[in-house]
Amino acid sequence: AVITGACDKDSQCGGGMCCAVSIWVKSIRICTPMGKLGDSCHPLTRKVPFFGRRMHHTCPCLPGLACLRTSFNRFICLAQK
């Protein structure tokens, strides 16, 4: 993830981003790019916009991509069928 600034909610981030938990410091949230093709994801990551405070360090996948299971407990952003 690219650090683009601290945040609390999605509304504080630019387009194509969400306010996700920092990989490095769990108490901090940072504006993080939405998942690209091949990125790891979680299928229950809240869609953008989310008005609460996220718990995951990943954002949802970009439009046109879906968070799909590739093996047990592993999910990746892939093109929607």
């Epitope: 979680h42 989310f50 008005f51 405070r53 718990m55 995951h56």
Partner: antibody
Framework: EVQLVQSGAEVKKPGASVKVSCKAS????????MHWVRQAPGQGLEWIGY????????TYNQKFKGRVTITVDKSTSTAYLELSSLRSEDTAVYYC??????????????WGQGTLVTVSS | DIVMTQSPDSLAVSLGERATINCKAS??????????MNWYQQKPGQPPKLLIY???NLESGVPDRFSGSGSGTDFTLTISSLQAEDVAVYYC?????????FGQGTKVEIK
């Protein structure tokens, strides 16, 4: 004060459809998702699905896929559950419940009073 | 689907004593260091009430005699000192994978 007020009890014949409403008040309706859960008489809880009250996006329990439709009317702050092709096993109390917005820890912090749907020939 | 199994099915505890309810998931409900497990209380004729979210976080307004613990597949709800108003059915719920599934419930009564 957050309140979820559901429509009244329904009696339906097998094969029919039912639509239950849930009117929300006391908070910003579009900022929270709404879940639907049911409870058969004397039984446990079963999650049906939820909807984003912001953009109408839905996630359903696959068990109900094709028979259930969850919608919202933002103008009246009301969520709806429609269940079709009813069978006797659908006899239950149906609850709407607001998502608590605790990040990805989906949790239901306010519940409607429940709507009893009875399916009987 | 993830199957949630609670034990015991029912529990009789003296007033002021500790009550412990267990919940076992058929697979891990952890993700990214968090446990995606909730606990609810339901009294007769009422809707459920959220007690604990994300395994160990006490919902606002819930007495601190309630606590949740556990990770992975094994979770516990503890009532440190049972009060008369705690007589109810308690449900665990996993929210790590759709469909969100509940345990079958544990009935807590006064001995």
């Amino acid at each position: 004060e957050v309140q979820l007020v559901q429509s009244g009890a329904e009696v339906k014949k097998p094969g029919a459809s039912v639509k239950v409403s849930c009117k929300a008040s006391g908070y910003s309706f579009t900022d929270y998702d709404m879940h639907w859960v049911r409870q058969a008489p004397g039984q446990g809880l079963e999650w049906i699905g939820y909807i984003s009250c912001y953009n109408g996006a839905t996630t359903y329990n696959q068990k109900f896929k094709g028979r259930v439709t969850i919608t919202v009317d933002k103008s009246t702050s009301t969520a709806y559950l429609e269940l079709s092709s009813l069978r006797s096993e659908d006899t239950a109390v149906y609850y709407c419940a607001r998502d608590a917005n605790y990040g990805e820890a989906y949790a239901m912090d306010y519940w409607g009073q429940g709507t009893l749907v009875t399916v009987s020939s | 689907d993830i199957v949630m199994t609670q034990s015991p099915d029912s529990l009789a505890v003296s007033l002021g004593e500790r009550a412990t309810i267990n919940c076992k998931a058929s697979q891990s409900v952890d993700y990214d260091g968090d446990s995606y497990m909730n606990w609810y209380q339901q009294k007769p004729g009422q809707p459920p009430k959220l007690l604990i979210y994300a395994a160990s976080n006490l919902e606002s307004g819930v007495p601190d005699r309630f606590s949740g613990s556990g990770s992975g597949t094994d979770f516990t709800l503890t009532i440190s000192s049972l009060q008369a108003e705690d007589v109810a059915v308690y449900y665990c719920q996993q929210i790590n994978e759709d469909p969100f599934t509940f345990g079958q419930g544990t009935k807590v009564e006064i001995k």
